[in-house]
């Protein structure tokens, strides 16, 4: 099945690459507009020049196109603990991420959060902190896994995932109990 | 102790409205990042949108962008979501929690109100 195209696509799809459809004569195929810069006014003629007007501070565009306005600079959000990597210029949007030693928590396809990079505290690290995921820990005997931090076997309840990892250590725990002094 | 209560969740129509609140205690409320999150009929969490402290530039999912509108009081330690055009998709538990802070779970969450748009 031949996917359906946007009425845009199809317009474009008419003209040699780097050109687009006259949105008023389809006999005339304009060219696109530089990264940087937005349509301020479509070609008047086949082989004459498109008018492209520069972004303006605070907006860009990433690719040629003809667009009408550009688009509005992304901030990063402090209150997710992002900070800016590279900032906004006419060509690219800006470029958030985290500070070193943390790494970045996807909530949805456009918001990411920052978090510290886990230590494997009473652990041992087996694969180191990434960009986009935290560091993956292995326990030292006596403890487990919680919430990617090593917690002793001592705060291990029954009904919890830790009763295997921890399974000698609560039957200690339930044999303390139960031996009473006669 | 942290405590969040959700209320104003009910049936409505497609394309009608509701404003659901969140009453907070136990901590300092107007410090936090406050967020809504919904959680539809056997599917996972959806991030809905959030507010910082001050209220500025708050975040909203495409899916609501243009829709939805979160607000809060600091005087009344109040978290809302007005949202409006209700679709059929909306239909969720929805919750307010506070931002996360030591990683991605959350810690605070309230129980929930039951979203249902149904003609």
């Known amino acids: 099945l031949v996917p359906h195209l946007g009425d845009r696509e199809k317009r474009d799809s008419v003209c040699p690459q780097g050109k687009y459809i006259h949105p008023q004569n389809n006999s005339i195929c304009c060219t696109k507009c530089h990264k940087g810069t937005y349509l301020y006014n479509d070609c008047p003629g086949p082989g004459q020049d498109t008018d492209c007007r520069e972004c303006e501070s605070g907006s860009f565009t990433a690719s040629e196109n003809h667009l009408r306005h550009c688009l509005s600079c992304s901030k990063c959000r402090k209150e997710m603990g992002q900070v800016e990597i590279s900032s906004c210029t006419v060509d690219r949007d800006t470029v958030c991420g985290c500070r070193k030693n943390q790494y970045r928590h996807y909530w949805s396809e456009n918001l990411f959060q920052c978090f510290n990079c886990s230590l494997c505290l009473n652990g041992t690290v087996h694969l180191s902190c990434q960009e986009k995921q935290n560091t993956v820990c292995t326990c030292h005997a006596g403890f487990f896994l919680r919430e990617n931090e090593c917690v002793s076997c001592s705060n291990c309840k029954k009904s919890l995932e830790c009763t295997k990892l921890c399974l000698p250590q609560i039957e200690n725990v339930k044999g303390t109990e139960d031996s009473g002094t006669t | 102790e942290v405590q969040l209560l959700e209320s104003g969740g009910g049936l409505v129509q497609p394309g009608g409205s509701l404003r659901l609140s969140c009453a907070a205690s136990g901590f300092t409320f107007a410090h936090e990042t406050m967020v809504w999150v919904r959680q539809a009929p056997g599917k996972g969490l959806e991030w809905v949108s959030h507010i910082p402290p001050d209220g500025q530039d708050p975040f909203y999912a495409d899916s609501v962008k243009g829709r939805f509108t979160i607000s809060r009081d600091n005087s009344k330690n109040t978290l809302y979501l007005q949202m409006n055009s209700l679709a059929a998709e909306d239909t969720a538990v929805y919750h307010c929690?506070?931002?996360?802070?030591?990683?991605?779970?959350?810690?605070?969450w309230g129980q929930g109100t039951l979203v249902t748009v149904s003609s």
């Open positions: 929690a506070l931002l996360p802070k030591r990683g991605p779970w959350f810690d605070y």
